[in-house]
């Protein structure tokens, strides 16, 4: 019982429970394929506990293995639209620091209007994750259709 | 070593390890779009450790941030069937208490016969999650094709 | 603070933090639908902390409930290719020991070129997970397009 109390008294950060769930804020200007994210209780059900946002991109604060997940739905989309605008592709990667730049997760829409996936990956403090949407279709800003998050899993 | 032993002796519930994985029981009557779930070792690989089922809907017992995931496959489905019956949509949301009602996760099938996604979301004790399937196609009841689960991640 | 230090000093294995993320190595010979996986820091961002590879298949070392996730993308694929080669199906299951053989997760590609899903499932020490891809299309070996992983969640 004493242990359980002790566990409660520890700041969660010391347990490494970094977690974030973001909602889409806006897309970038024409030559910038990045999606810009936002999070926080004032916005609804999005939040950042540990990681931070840097100009709409997610920056990691704790080394470890993370579960990264994303769902993106295209706005005003049908299977005909999606196939006509193929290739529309989403890629999640480390975009900074440049020395660690790598694509972590990539999906194409083909004849669908939603992609959703997740993966485990090592991330380091200071890594910034970017989500690039290439193509001519807009992502939905509905919070139940487009979201992006990370969860610290272990050191 | 003593700490590891102490940890083992604590009930898992005190660590907040609430988790559930459910299989489809049945669909609702005609005007009810909800899917009705079931879980327990007697049924196979489904289980509830913490959350409970209330008339086939999942009720949360511990406040926290949860990873919610779902996969639904349509029965006797081809891409032709799926596109013909568009829109077939799945939505996961808090349906009770009414004051907290919100859609958490939404996907359309378009030309596919399976949707799968996951997200992090804050849930509170007493929240009931409903999964609404709108359209005229039946969800598969095969346990490897249709399932729904939650995992407590942090307070 | 003392607790935090104690926690750090404990081997992670004693906390049950088994986790693995694998990348595709190769497909099997003609009559073998299994995908063969590889993992380790020398290969990039794949890793095994607890589970092991046995002839390219993932073997579990710790009893518990696991989150299993997978993404497979077909190589040189368009929606036309995918529909023409239907059914192309991916199944993840316990393939050994034979007494515990079961399909855990199954998806068809239909008119898409990528499948991605995840589920919670109980696994036991010694369970070997196999991923069977049936059809006449090759999976992509790009590490951001095809991957397979497990994460221990609780006892």
């Amino acid at each position: 019982q004493r242990f359980a109390q002790a566990q409660q008294q520890l700041p969660l950060e010391s347990l490494g429970w970094d977690v974030a769930e973001l909602q889409l804020n806006h897309t970038g200007p024409q030559q910038d394929p990045r999606l810009y994210w936002q999070g926080g209780p004032a916005l609804g059900r999005s939040f950042l506990h540990g990681p931070e946002l840097d100009k709409g991109q997610l920056r990691i604060h704790r080394d470890g293995i993370y579960m990264v997940h994303i769902q993106v739905t295209l706005a005003i989309c049908s299977s005909t639209t999606a196939s006509r605008h193929h290739p529309t592709t989403l890629a999640v990667g480390i975009c900074s620091p440049a020395s660690r730049s790598i694509s972590l997760l990539r999906l194409s829409f083909h004849q669908g209007c939603t992609i959703a996936s997740q993966r485990l990956t090592p991330l380091a403090r200071g890594d910034t994750l970017c989500t690039n949407l290439t193509g001519t279709l807009l992502p939905s800003r509905n919070t139940d259709e487009t979201f992006f998050g990370v969860q610290w899993v272990r050191p | 070593q003593r700490f590891a032993q102490a940890q083992q002796q604590l009930p898992l519930e005190s660590l907040g390890w609430d988790v559930a994985e459910l299989q489809l029981n049945h669909t609702g009557p005609q005007q009810d779009p909800r899917l009705y779930w079931q879980g327990g070792p007697a049924l196979g690989r489904s289980f509830l450790h913490g959350p409970e089922l209330d008339k086939g809907q999942l009720r949360i017992h511990r406040d926290g941030i949860y990873m919610v995931h779902i996969q639904v496959t349509l029965a006797i489905c081809s891409s032709t069937t799926a596109s013909r019956h568009h829109p077939t949509t799945l939505a996961v949301g808090i349906c009770s208490p009414a004051s907290r009602s919100i859609s958490l996760l939404r996907l359309s099938f378009h030309q596919g016969c399976t949707i799968a996604s996951q997200r992090l979301t804050p849930l509170a004790r007493g929240d009931t999650l409903c999964t609404n399937l709108t359209g005229t196609l039946l969800p598969s009841r095969n346990t490897d094709e249709t399932f729904f689960g939650v995992q407590w991640v942090r307070p | 603070q003392r607790f935090a230090q104690a926690q750090q000093q404990l081997p992670l294995e004693s906390l049950g933090w088994d986790v693995a993320e694998l990348q595709l190595n190769h497909t099997g010979p003609q009559q073998d639908p299994r995908l063969y996986w590889q993992g380790g820091p020398a290969l990039g961002r794949s890793f095994l902390h607890g589970p092991e590879l046995d002839k390219g298949q993932l073997r579990i070392h710790r009893d518990g409930i696991y989150m299993v996730h997978i993404q497979v993308t077909l190589a040189i694929c368009s929606s036309t290719t995918a529909s023409r080669h239907h059914p192309t199906t991916l199944a993840v299951g316990i393939c050994s020991p034979a007494s515990r053989s079961i399909s855990l997760l199954r998806l068809s590609f239909h008119q898409g070129c990528t499948i991605a899903s995840q589920r919670l499932t109980p696994l036991a020490r010694g369970d070997t997970l196999c991923t069977n891809l049936t059809g006449t299309l090759l999976p992509s070996r790009n590490t951001d397009e095809t991957f397979f992983g497990v994460q221990w969640v609780r006892p």
Partner: antibody, heavy 120, light 111 residues
Framework: EVQLVQSGAEVKKPGSSVKVSCKAS????????MHWVRQAPGQGLEWMGA????????SYNQNFKGRVTLTADKSTSTAYMELSSLRSEDTAVYYC?????????????WGQGTLVTVSS | DIVMTQSPDSLAVSLGERATINCRAS??????????MHWYQQKPGQPPKLLIS???NLESGVPDRFSGSGSGTDFTLTISSLQAEDVAVYYC?????????FGQGTKLEIK
């Protein structure tokens, strides 16, 4: 409650064609396959084909070897079944039918039936 | 095509007694956790009436003396206590694939 109302009885000569209509009440007409089933006097039920009014896509029973044509008019919520090259064994009651909720080929709603008599 | 075979072709049962009709499919009509087998009742001069869908799902308004069971290839329609108004021809039908096919029918009479 959906109602399916079919056109009246027909008497036809061998070698000719017949076109039977089926008007559906309600606004769900485009979303459900409309099936056609026939029953010869004193015999069992035989599925002929189906049309999905939303797109006009059809499926046919190969036993009819291209003699049956299904069409639909969304504006009037009416489905049509045309059977050509009639012979005496085509004498039967022809039913339109559809499901009530799930769009699979079992039939909650049936038309009242249209008797087609083929006789010289 | 899947061939549906009903037995018996005709059946005479006393009022209040149990009536059982069997249907066998030439291959499994089960898929996705369902059995795509359905039962109809047809009275003279009327279209068929759906009694049971998906092997065991009693349709709205159908008396609960009717029940269905079975999976794979073998199915049964049971009337637990025969009533006079149950005299009719009963058909099984599958919808597992196209074309859907019907059994030849079983004529149920009162003994």
């Amino acid at each position: 409650e959906v109602q399916l109302v079919q056109s009246g009885a027909e008497v036809k000569k061998p070698g000719s064609s017949v076109k039977v209509s089926c008007k559906a009440s309600g606004d769900t007409f485009p979303r459900y396959n409309m099936h056609w089933v026939r029953q010869a006097p004193g015999q069992g039920l035989e599925w002929m084909g189906a049309i999905f009014p939303g797109t006009g896509e059809t499926s046919y029973n190969q036993n009819f070897k291209g003699r049956v044509t299904l069409t639909a008019d969304k504006s009037t919520s009416t489905a049509y079944m045309e059977l050509s090259s009639l012979r005496s064994e085509d004498t039967a009651v022809y039913y339109c039918a559809r499901n009530s909720y799930y769009d699979y080929a079992w039939f909650t709603y049936w038309g009242q039936g249209t008797l087609v008599t083929v006789s010289s | 095509d899947i061939v549906m075979t009903q037995s018996p072709d005709s059946l005479a049962v006393s009022l209040g007694e149990r009536a059982t009709i069997n249907c066998r499919a030439s291959k499994s009509v089960s898929s996705s956790g369902y059995s795509f087998m359905h039962w109809y009742q047809q009275k003279p001069g009327q279209p068929p009436k759906l009694l049971i869908s998906l092997a065991d799902n009693l349709e709205s308004g159908v008396p609960d003396r009717f029940s269905g069971s079975g999976s794979g290839t073998d199915f049964t329609l049971t009337i637990s206590s025969l009533q006079a108004e149950d005299v009719a021809v009963y058909y099984c039908q599958h919808s597992r694939e196209f074309p859907p096919t019907f059994g030849q029918g079983t004529k149920l009479e009162i003994k």
